[in-house]
């Protein structure tokens, strides 16, 4: 069951999944100047079995003036630091992100790629938050967001983050040891 | 403080069409969805539909489809549920629910008894 | 649709006693379970939410567990204004209810 909406906007935060889960689909989008190629995929699409989950479909580009198809290309690390997921700077991904059974790890990038990624998440799917570049996290709570389904209707959690402007950048878990996420009930939802 | 407040009962003939409100106050009504379930007399519950206070999006139980709907005016925090076609097993306590921050119905409106009878 | 069977229909008590009752879901909610309390001539008051949250202002003697499709509301110290009618609820597909448990003197 994918998720009707996006997951909720917080000020001066980012979001991002360590993994994603099975049923995840991810737009094959291309940078300006280039588009799918003809009889292309238009998004892939994470499957798997009880063991193993992987990336169906591959996402290819070729120039707008030209007829002829690109081949995949895993670009250099300098120029994967320069992608983005869904509303966000895709920082380096934790080791251990591809060990969730169920889930897919970051695809990796595709040749004349959109400089932002669109993905279209599954209920189930959770996404952390941190803030960005000289903004300090207050925390109320977890942040972190998770696509619920509840009366037959999809929405987000709402995460409990704060970001103030002071120079001091909280950390997406894996990054660095995670905090404890307090159990409860959330103060708000963001419904969908 | 949160209040569901109702309009009164009401004895309705078969085929005819029925419609209750429910009046919110105490709390911010676009924030919150807001059900309709029914208790026919010595029955359990029976959730109808819901519809998105803020937005206007709604859904119902397969049942009611096609006889139910589910409307609201934010400007005077009431949402409205009518029932057409009106047969005699929806003989029923009709409540509206709030539904909360934990997604069950924290606060109910107090019924509205419908009778369908020749 | 998911079915909800609630179980026993009736269970005689007395004041002090534990009090157990059951519902099964016939596929898997998620922990999307509600518990309320039902008087006649009243609309029905939460006092469960998600499978084992204790709804603000409810006395600590009900509490909720799951285990798998199993749901459980117990009272752990029966009390005068407990003899009602408790119904489940599941909320993670279209809402669908139990069919409730009369809590009646013994």
């Known amino acids: 069951e994918l998720c009707d909406d996006d997951p909720p906007e917080i000020p001066h935060a980012t979001f991002k999944a360590m993994a994603y889960k099975e049923g995840t689909m991810l737009n094959c989008e291309c940078k300006r100047g280039f588009r799918r190629i003809k009889s292309g995929s238009l998004y892939m699409l994470c499957t798997g079995n009880s063991s193993h989950s992987s990336w169906d479909n591959q996402c290819q580009c070729t120039s707008s003036a030209t007829r002829n198809t690109t081949k995949q290309v895993t670009p250099q690390p300098e120029e994967q630091k320069e992608r983005k997921t869904t509303e966000m700077q895709s920082p380096m991904q934790p080791v251990d992100q591809a060990s969730l059974p169920g889930h897919c790890r970051e695809p990796p990038p595709w040749e004349n790629e959109a400089t932002e990624r669109i993905y279209h998440f599954v209920v189930g799917q959770m996404v952390y938050y941190q803030c960005v570049q000289g903004y300090r996290a207050l925390h109320r709570g977890p942040a972190e967001s998770v696509c619920k389904m509840t009366h037959g209707k999809t929405r987000w959690t709402q995460p409990q983050l704060i970001c103030t402007g002071e120079m001091e950048t909280s950390q997406f878990p894996g990054e660095e040891k995670p905090q404890a996420s307090p159990e409860g009930r959330p103060e708000s939802e963001t419904s969908c | 403080q949160v209040q569901l407040v109702q309009s009164g009962a009401e004895v309705k003939k078969p085929g005819a069409s029925l419609k209750v409100s429910c009046k919110a106050s105490g709390y911010t009504f676009t924030g919150y969805y807001m059900h309709w379930v029914r208790q026919a007399p010595g029955q359990g519950l029976e959730w109808m539909g819901w519809i998105n206070s803020n937005s206007g999006d709604k859904r119902y139980a397969q049942k009611f489809q096609g006889r139910v709907t589910v409307t609201r005016d934010t400007s005077i925090s009431t949402a409205y549920m009518e029932l057409s076609r009106l047969r005699s097993d929806d003989t029923a306590v009709y409540y509206c629910?709030?539904?909360?921050?934990?997604?069950?119905?924290?606060?109910w409106g107090q019924g509205t008894m419908v009778i369908v009878s020749s | 649709d998911i079915q909800m069977t609630q179980s026993p229909s009736t269970l005689s008590a007395s004041v002090g006693d534990r009090v157990t009752i059951t519902c099964r879901a016939s596929?898997?909610?998620?922990?999307?379970l509600a518990w309320y309390q039902q008087k006649p001539g009243k609309a029905p008051k939460l006092l469960i939410y998600k499978a084992s949250s204790l709804e603000s202002g409810v006395p600590s003697r009900f509490s909720g567990s799951e285990s798998g499709t199993e749901f459980t509301l117990t009272i752990s110290s029966l009390q005068p204004d407990d003899f009602a009618t408790y119904y489940c609820q599941q909320y993670n597909s279209y809402s669908t209810f139990g069919q409730g448990t009369k809590v009646e003197i013994k």
């Open positions: 596929q898997s909610i998620s922990s999307w």
């Open positions: 629910a709030r539904e909360g921050a934990g997604d069950a119905f924290d606060f």
